[in-house]
């Protein structure tokens, strides 16, 4: 008897949906793989007899249940199968976005990009998809704890009126309210202000 | 709402000619990879052509050199002009559409696709 696949899961972010497992203990010898997934009640194979212990399934609608089952197979046996199912649009993670900071004496200028979609030749991003895409910014002192949090309007913001010769921290996320889901955080930028530019009458 | 719609089927000799023509609304139609699927009574739903964003096409075997599909961005028409019909072409004719999709993947099958219309009915008689 063949065991089946252990820890089967689907690894997605930005709609690159990878189904991962893990080989089970078998002393006869090296098992292989067989990945399918469900498409109008037909199973259609994605990876068949594979060594590798994932399947990429990024083909998939993003929009649909889907269907995906895995199995071990040593010779002409077999393992059960083991299913999951998978709606892209609501469980792929939504990766960090970009972000560019500028300095402007007292001010922090940031603009922001949207992931872009995985393995898509053209330059679609996920706020193409989602319609009530928008970004958190969390910003701080570097070296303090208090964390401040805004939502902006547009792909950009401004924060103004920082302390001079100051380090400000920057992140920044994909937030989608519609769905209460949020993204990944990106990694801290960290920035020195310089003087305060206003003349005093 | 993406919304699909079908039209142009019917009652055709073996030999003639049909054109579909799949109306789409709801969204940037010039960013979705489309296709056009059949499925014939008891049998499964297959793959008939389909076209990129970028306008690549592909066809099952079984249509090539008889079928043509294009797209009209202008008018958000999606169409499958089918020639030399044979009566194993019978079917019900679907549009279907993914959005925001290149032509990475060259999808061809259902659940590649996320939206689809109703259908509409082509019937060939020899």
């Known amino acids: 008897m063949v065991p089946p696949p252990e820890n089967v899961r689907m690894n997605s972010v930005n709609f690159k949906n990878i189904l991962q497992w893990e080989s089970p203990a078998f002393a006869k010898g090296n098992l292989t793989f067989t990945a399918q997934y469900l498409s109008y009640r037909i199973f259609q194979d994605k990876c068949m007899n594979t060594t590798l212990t994932e399947c990429d399934f990024s083909s998939l609608s993003k929009y649909g249940d889907h269907t995906l089952r895995v199995r071990a197979e040593f010779a002409d046996e077999h393992s059960d199968w083991v299913n999951i199912t998978f709606c892209p649009v609501d469980d792929t993670i939504i990766g960090p976005p970009g972000m560019q900071v500028e300095v402007l004496a007292d001010s922090l200028h940031m603009r922001f990009l949207a992931p872009k979609i995985e393995n898509e030749y053209e330059t679609w991003t996920m706020k193409n998809v989602y319609n009530s895409w928008t970004y958190n910014v969390q910003y701080w002192k570097n070296g303090t704890d208090e964390k401040f949090q805004i939502t902006p309007q547009y792909d950009f913001e401004v924060l103004r009126n920082l302390e001079p010769w100051t380090t400000y921290c920057v992140q920044v996320r994909g937030f989608l309210p519609d769905r209460n889901k949020a993204g990944e955080w990106s990694e801290p930028v960290c920035e020195q202000t310089t003087h305060d530019e206003t003349v005093p009458s | 709402q993406v919304q699909l719609q079908e039209s142009g089927g019917g009652s055709v000799q073996a030999g003639g000619s049909l054109r579909l023509s799949c109306a789409a609304s709801g969204y940037t139609y010039s960013s979705y990879c489309m296709g056009w699927f059949r499925q014939a009574p008891g049998k499964g739903r297959e793959g008939v052509a389909a076209i990129d964003s970028d306008g690549s096409t592909r066809y099952a075997d079984s249509v090539k050199g008889r079928f043509t599909i294009s797209k009209d961005n202008a008018k958000n028409t999606l169409y499958l002009q089918m020639n030399s019909l044979k009566p194993e072409d019978t079917a019900m004719y679907y549009c279907?559409?993914?959005?925001?999709?290149?032509?990475?993947?060259?999808?061809?099958?259902?659940?590649?696709?996320?939206?689809w219309g109703q259908g509409t009915q082509v019937t060939v008689s020899s």
């Open positions: 279907a559409a993914e959005p925001y999709c290149s032509g990475g993947y060259k999808r061809t099958m259902v659940a590649e696709f996320g939206y």
